[in-house]
């Protein structure tokens, strides 16, 4: 007789699922000799008991407390880039910016990123089925929670000058609702953070209008203001000249605004 | 098995660029760091960068930086390595390069070598 | 850069003989050293890994030792198949860097 499963309205979890988490890290400690000291078997070990045999609903950040150990790393707290609805671009930076960090350019965001996981209550199974969806079933699943947790540390760990990039192209340019407002912004330190820059990504070539303007930008400012910290606002009117000109700062059309 | 085939050799003339490829078979292309090690003739290994392919990352040692591009495609489970305004110095043997799960961080794995001459 | 000073950069030895190179890292490099055996027209074979890690098939003739800055490769009973060029190289920081090879000659 086949057991029941569960049915959640969201993917299962990612095929291969614990070998990329072992092979990231194996490729993030090759890359990144600092980090040599982690044993990838037991940061595996800590994700997997984070959400095995556990209700895919009721998961904690206490459970992910293990890998969080494991996972320690520090970065320059003043070099830190946030993001929202702009991964890729974020990512295209730190790649060219090479002493600036994303999320996703430590350990553990990199472990996770892009991908989904869960488990079933009482069974060691790795659901490859379905797992819950964040809107449709539970915001308590492991990997919202698992989001929540290192994008808490995170913030929590900037200083000085943080900046964050912002998606110009999207109705919501800062999203209350998005990781980086319901999380990260909370979760500033007003004793170490002076100022919160953000970088309006435009995405229309002809589009220049000062977006930092906009009414959800003003919104982020005053919850910025309200805890003590300075806000400040760019446009990026041309994302690849702006790439461009980060690669290649001395070029004579970088002098101009971007 | 764990294979990395490398392209044919090839001549070029100075100024000329160059692009070598090495297709992996054996394991998952993503799951692993490509590296680019250079062996000029009658002379020692010199390390030149590495593509992490699942992420497109890449990292190029400063001698070689504005003159080296190391990319991957996915698709094809092939990493390429392209060197440009080739000069005389690099008429060399370049190899691709993999470490393995129980071998530290060094290489077990290695393609066969593409010699590249550059002469005018 | 890290600098690896390889020494001697050739020797001649004869067969059933002790072998043993050396390699200096210019700063600490923990136990983050390979060795690595390359014969004329072949592509580098690793022997040694973090130090003193025989890979996988290695014979028990090679060895390896050290940590921080100085390390040793040993070939206990040199064989007629053993003529090559071996290399150290650091893999602790980036860029990795090789030393600049020993050429094993039989006498």
């Known amino acids: 007789v086949p057991r029941w499963r569960q049915q959640w309205s969201g993917p299962g979890t990612t095929k291969r699922f614990p070998e990329t988490v072992l092979a990231r890290c194996v490729k993030y400690t090759e890359i990144h000799p600092e980090m040599r000291h982690v044993d990838c078997q037991s940061v595996w070990d800590a994700f997997k008991g984070a959400f095995i045999s556990k209700h895919p609903c009721n998961i904690t950040e206490e459970d992910y407390q293990p890998l969080m150990k494991l996972g320690t790393q520090t970065v320059p707290c003043n070099k830190i880039l946030l993001w929202s609805r702009i991964k890729d671009l974020a990512h295209q930076f730190t790649q060219v910016q090479r002493d600036m960090f994303t999320l996703e350019d430590t350990l553990l965001g990199y472990l996770a990123d892009d991908l989904t996981w869960c488990g079933e209550f009482n069974t060691s199974k790795i659901n490859y089925q379905s797992c819950p969806d964040w809107r449709k079933d539970c915001s308590n699943n492991p990997v919202s929670v698992f989001w929540k947790t290192v994008s808490r540390r995170f913030a929590e760990a900037a200083c000085d000058v943080v900046h964050v990039m912002l998606n110009g192209s999207r109705s919501k340019i800062f999203d209350k609702n998005s990781t980086f407002g319901s999380v990260e912004v909370h979760n500033l330190q007003p004793e170490k953070v002076q100022t919160l820059e953000a970088w309006v990504i435009h995405g229309g070539r002809e589009d220049s209008r000062d977006l930092c303007q906009d009414p959800t930008i003003k919104e982020l400012e005053s919850i910025i203001s309200k805890r003590n910290i300075q806000f400040s606002c760019k446009n990026i009117y041309r994302p690849d000249k702006f790439l461009q000109c980060v690669k290649n700062p001395e070029d004579s059309s970088c002098t101009s605004e971007i | 098995e764990v294979q990395l085939v490398q392209s044919g050799a090839e001549v070029k003339k100075p100024g000329a660029t160059v692009k070598i490829s090495c297709k992996v078979s054996?394991?998952?292309?993503?799951?692993?760091?490509m590296n680019w090690v250079q062996q000029g003739p009658g002379k020692g290994l010199e390390w030149m960068g590495w593509i992490d392919p699942e992420y497109g990352r890449t990292d190029v040692a400063e001698k070689f930086q504005g003159r080296v591009t190391i990319t991957a495609d996915t698709s094809t489970d092939t990493a390429y390595m392209e060197l440009s305004s080739l000069r005389s110095e690099d008429t060399a043997v370049y190899y691709c390069a993999r470490t393995g799960y129980q071998s530290g961080y060094g290489f077990p794995y290695w393609g066969q070598g593409t010699t590249v001459t550059v002469s005018s | 850069d890290i600098q690896m000073t390889q020494s001697p950069s050739s020797l001649s030895a004869s067969v059933g003989d002790r072998v043993t190179i050396t390699c200096k890292a210019s700063q600490n490099v923990d136990s983050d050293v390979d060795w690595y055996q390359q014969k004329p027209g072949k592509a580098p074979k690793l022997l040694i890994y973090?130090?003193?890690n025989r890979y996988t098939g290695v014979p028990s003739r090679f060895s390896g030792s050290g940590s921080g800055t100085d390390f040793t490769f040993t070939i206990s009973s040199l064989q007629p198949e053993d003529i090559a060029t071996y290399y150290c190289?650091?893999?602790?920081?980036?860029?990795?860097?090789f030393g600049g090879g020993t050429k094993v000659e039989i006498k």
């Open positions: 973090k130090a003193s």
């Open positions: 190289m650091q893999s602790n920081t980036h860029p990795r860097t």
């Open positions: 054996g394991y998952t292309f993503t799951d692993s760091v």
